[in-house]
């Protein structure tokens, strides 16, 4: 009996530019002789329904149809036909199929590969054209994929130490697509510093599919207006 097992759940998520290993494990009733078996990996794009051969292994020969694609002969001996793809790109997302032949038996499995890119986040203070006592804080998130992203603003005061979401005076712009397929977006918070307590901590909170925990950039309102430190003005996260 020959069986193939892919990633549990049928989906694998990988970061952009990573060296991804797409899992494919072989279960066979006898010890595997790699000289008399075949492995073929196929890829089907998200955008068109045509299947393309990525890698082929047959006995004493292997061929990569995607540069750098490889199945380890040394892992194959112990039933691991996983495909290594170095420097994975956004356009390589889609369905991957692992086909195993141990003559006369054949088994296959499929997995969906999702490629994600994590946003970098930075805070900027924009004072241009602002009225007296009025500040505009911009939270820029860049280089993320997929497009769906959630940016919120929170504040913590000495009176209320638990974060409170700010819903007023927040404008989040449209997402902009970059040349490399990733996205950027900017969210703005308008503040009237005369009405806010010094010592209040404001946070821009970015939630995205690529992040295990939200990305947080913060600044503290000081008694002297606009006295943000340079690092607070351009708080970089990756």
């Amino acid at each position: 009996d020959l069986k193939v097992e892919m990633m549990a759940g049928g989906t694998q998520i990988t970061p952009l530019n990573d060296n991804v290993t797409i899992f494919c494990n072989i279960f066979y009733s006898q010890p595997l002789n790699i000289t008399s078996m075949g492995i073929t990996w196929f890829w089907k794009s998200l955008t068109f329904d045509k299947e393309v051969k990525v890698f082929e292994f047959f006995g004493d020969h292997q061929e990569a149809f995607r540069p750098g694609a490889i199945v380890s002969p040394w892992r194959l001996k112990s039933g691991d036909a996983s495909l290594r793809l170095p420097g994975i790109q956004l356009e390589e997302a889609g369905e991957y199929r692992c086909e195993v032949v141990v003559t006369p038996l054949k088994a296959q499995g499929t997995v969906q590969l999702e490629v994600v890119a994590s946003p970098a986040s930075r805070l900027l203070l924009d004072q241009v054209g602002m009225k007296e006592n009025e500040d505009k804080y911009m939270c820029e998130s860049s280089g993320f994929y997929p497009e769906a992203i959630n940016i919120t603003w929170e504040k913590q005061t000495q009176k209320f130490p638990h974060p409170i979401e700010i819903s007023e005076d927040v404008i989040t712009g449209p997402t902009i697509k970059n040349m490399d397929g990733t996205f950027n977006v900017t969210s703005c918070l308008k503040l009237n510093s005369s009405q806010e307590d010094p010592g209040t901590v404001y946070q821009c909170v970015v939630r995205h599919a690529s992040l295990h925990t939200p990305l947080r950039s913060n600044f503290t309102l000081t008694a002297a207006r606009h006295s943000l430190s340079e690092t607070e003005k351009t708080d970089n996260f990756s």
Epitope: D60, W74, R75
Partner: antibody, heavy 120, light 111 residues
């Protein structure tokens, strides 16, 4: 920085078992196999087998089959090698070594070694 | 099993002079155009360290005075100018077939 840190020296009686651990750090544990190699006093190197942390699959040197068990705990990036029914000629330094498996096959980083002495 | 025979088993070299070690395999260690032969150096009291893999590729951080050549069954490790720090035992290893086997070792000493 890639590091493989092995457990301390062991003294065992004939017929007993020994379990050596190898804690890996500085790289993605599942991207490489772990080889186990031993060296008897004043002797050369002998490959015992390897384990694939990706699926737990093992390849053992026929010489040790039935006596050796290699396992991994991916949650703590640690590989283990257990050798049972010890004999005096199992007295050796046991090494774990990180093994590249995609672009060739070679052991590029080695643990410091664990001395196992089998004596009655 | 593939048997690897190293020659010489020991050699004594004057610093600055070249050295050469041969490794012969009982059968070919080539597969799909590549040679699966590796070279290691074991310095006294230390674990082995990788010098060369795939017959001729220098491992990162290894001085370029070391070089490897050969294919099929005949392989050579060369040191263009031996230095005091090169003392130890040199092993060839094949990784084409299991069990992966080592040569018996060549001890390099400084004159």
């Amino acid at each position: 920085e890639v590091q493989l840190v092995q457990s301390g020296a062991e003294v065992k009686k004939p017929g007993a078992s020994v379990k050596v651990s190898c804690k890996a750090s500085g790289y993605t544990f599942t991207d490489y196999n772990m080889d186990w190699v031993r060296q008897a006093p004043g002797q050369g190197l002998e490959w015992m087998g390897d384990i694939n942390p990706n699926n737990g699959g093992t390849l053992y040197n026929q010489k040790f089959r039935g006596r050796v068990t290699m396992t991994v705990d991916t949650s703590i990036s640690t590989a283990y090698m257990e050798l049972s029914r010890l004999r005096s000629d199992d007295t050796a330094v046991y090494y774990c070594a990180r093994s590249e498996v995609f672009y060739g096959n070679y052991a590029d980083y080695w643990g410091q070694g664990t001395t196992v002495t089998v004596s009655s | 099993d593939i048997v690897l025979t190293q020659t010489p088993l020991s050699l004594s070299v004057t610093p600055g002079q070249p050295a050469s070690i041969s490794c012969k395999a009982s059968q070919s260690v080539d597969y799909d155009g590549d040679s699966y032969m590796n070279w290691y150096l074991q310095k006294p009291g230390q674990p082995p360290q990788l010098l060369i893999y795939a017959a001729s590729t220098l491992h990162s951080g290894v001085p370029d005075r070391f070089s490897g050549s050969g294919s099929g069954t005949d392989f050579t490790l060369k040191i263009s100018r031996v230095e005091a720090e090169d003392v130890g035992v040199y092993y060839c290893q094949q990784s084409k077939e299991d069990p992966r086997t080592f040569g018996q070792g060549t001890k390099l000493e400084i004159k």
